[in-house]
């Protein structure tokens, strides 16, 4: 999916109002220095591409993020403010239901969410630069 035509201001507002709080809640008990940020992004569409990948694509050591509240809100935000995004999710949603896994917060998942926080912050910064 090409995130170029998204309403970035609306996405930023949703992130600051609610998604960020859920990400921070998920990370509670860990320090920001616990993990190194290894994933970066260069512009707003690229940031959203990386955010989508890290939030919804299961990895061998962290398969459960898509069911988290911040992930559900991220999906809702992208479906609302990115033209045509929702239709790309119809088959993906059905596949995810079949893949349902036990919810476990592993250290690897905490590291992934730490990366997500970094990507979202980068997204906000690239937005501020453009204004």
């Amino acid at each position: 999916y090409d995130f170029t035509n998204c309403d970035f201001q609306k996405i930023e507002a949703d992130y600051l109002r609610t998604i960020s709080k859920d990400l921070i809640t998920y990370m509670s008990g860990t320090k920001s220095t616990d993990f190194n940020n290894t994933v970066s992004c260069s512009n707003r569409p690229h940031c959203l591409t990386e955010i989508q990948s890290l939030t919804f694509n299961p990895t061998p050591r962290c398969a459960s993020l898509a069911k988290e509240m911040f992930a559900r809100k991220t999906k809702a935000t992208l479906a609302l403010w990115c033209p045509g995004y929702s239709e790309t999710q119809i088959n993906a949603t059905q596949a995810m239901k079949k893949r349902r896994k036990r919810k476990v917060t592993t250290n690897k998942c905490l590291e992934q969410v730490s990366q997500l926080l970094g990507l979202w912050r980068r997204f906000i910064r690239t937005l501020l630069k453009k204004q």
């Epitope: 809100k73 479906a79 609302l80 033209p83 239709e87």
Partner: antibody, heavy 120, light 107 residues
């Protein structure tokens, strides 16, 4: 089963406001946005706006911006649509309709409609 | 704002005939089109979503096709209960919009 039950018909004077409610049951309220659509007598469907409980945000059709306010009470699974500065052209049936925000993404259930008559 | 134009405005057919309804978008919207049926005094009812996806409980005589700017709703053999107004709707981008409607009436 999924049900959206709207408040009863209203007769209003020009310049006044009306608040229509839509009580949802049979599903998880926060998994769906609530949209409002109106239909003037003998006319087509017109999207007014939406409230997304999951994100606590709303969006409006520019034609209604400033006059329409869409809210929701998550504790009672009830959505509201308030329209102010009413004029005769606002005489219409107002529908609420749910739409999935993390799946389905389509208005798959509708309220029965609320007739609002604006007359002096 | 994406404008949806439906044609024809009215379709006069007999029971058993095939109905073909058209919906044209003012810009490409991939497959983000849904079809609704509305009978007098009733709320709209979803028939087809995302251009061609069928809904459980909807008779299989209803089918949808198309992508980009041109979409079609087909009713293979009209039954008496199918005479109604049909609307297409786009959810490609906000504000969501509806088509002008096609009335299918008995000839």
């Amino acid at each position: 089963q999924v049900q959206l039950v709207q408040s009863g018909p209203e007769v209003k004077k020009p310049g006044s406001s009306v608040k229509v409610s839509c009580k949802a049951s049979g599903y998880i309220f926060t998994d769906y946005a609530m949209h409002w659509v109106r239909q003037r007598p003998g006319q087509g469907l017109e999207w007014m706006g939406t409230f997304i409980p999951l994100l606590d945000t709303s969006d409006y059709n520019q034609n209604f911006k400033g006059r329409a306010t869409i809210t929701a009470d998550k504790s009672t699974s009830t959505a509201y649509m308030e329209l102010s500065s009413l004029r005769s052209e606002d005489t219409a049936v107002y529908y609420c309709a749910r739409m999935g925000v993390t799946h389905s993404y389509v208005m798959d259930a509708w309220g029965q409609g609320t007739l609002v008559t604006v007359s002096s | 704002e994406i404008v949806l134009t439906q044609s024809p405005g009215t379709l006069s057919l007999s029971p058993g005939e095939r109905a073909t309804l058209s919906c044209r978008a003012s810009q490409p919207i991939s497959i983000s089109v849904h079809w609704y049926q509305q009978k007098p005094g009733e709320a709209p009812r979803l028939l087809i979503y995302f251009a061609s996806q069928s809904i459980s409980g909807i008779p299989d005589r209803f089918s949808g096709s198309g992508s980009g700017t041109d979409f079609t709703l087909t009713i293979s053999r009209l039954e008496s209960e199918d005479f109604a107004v049909y609307y297409c709707q786009q959810t490609f981008s906000l504000p969501y919009t509806f088509g002008t409607g096609t009335k299918v009436e008995i000839k």
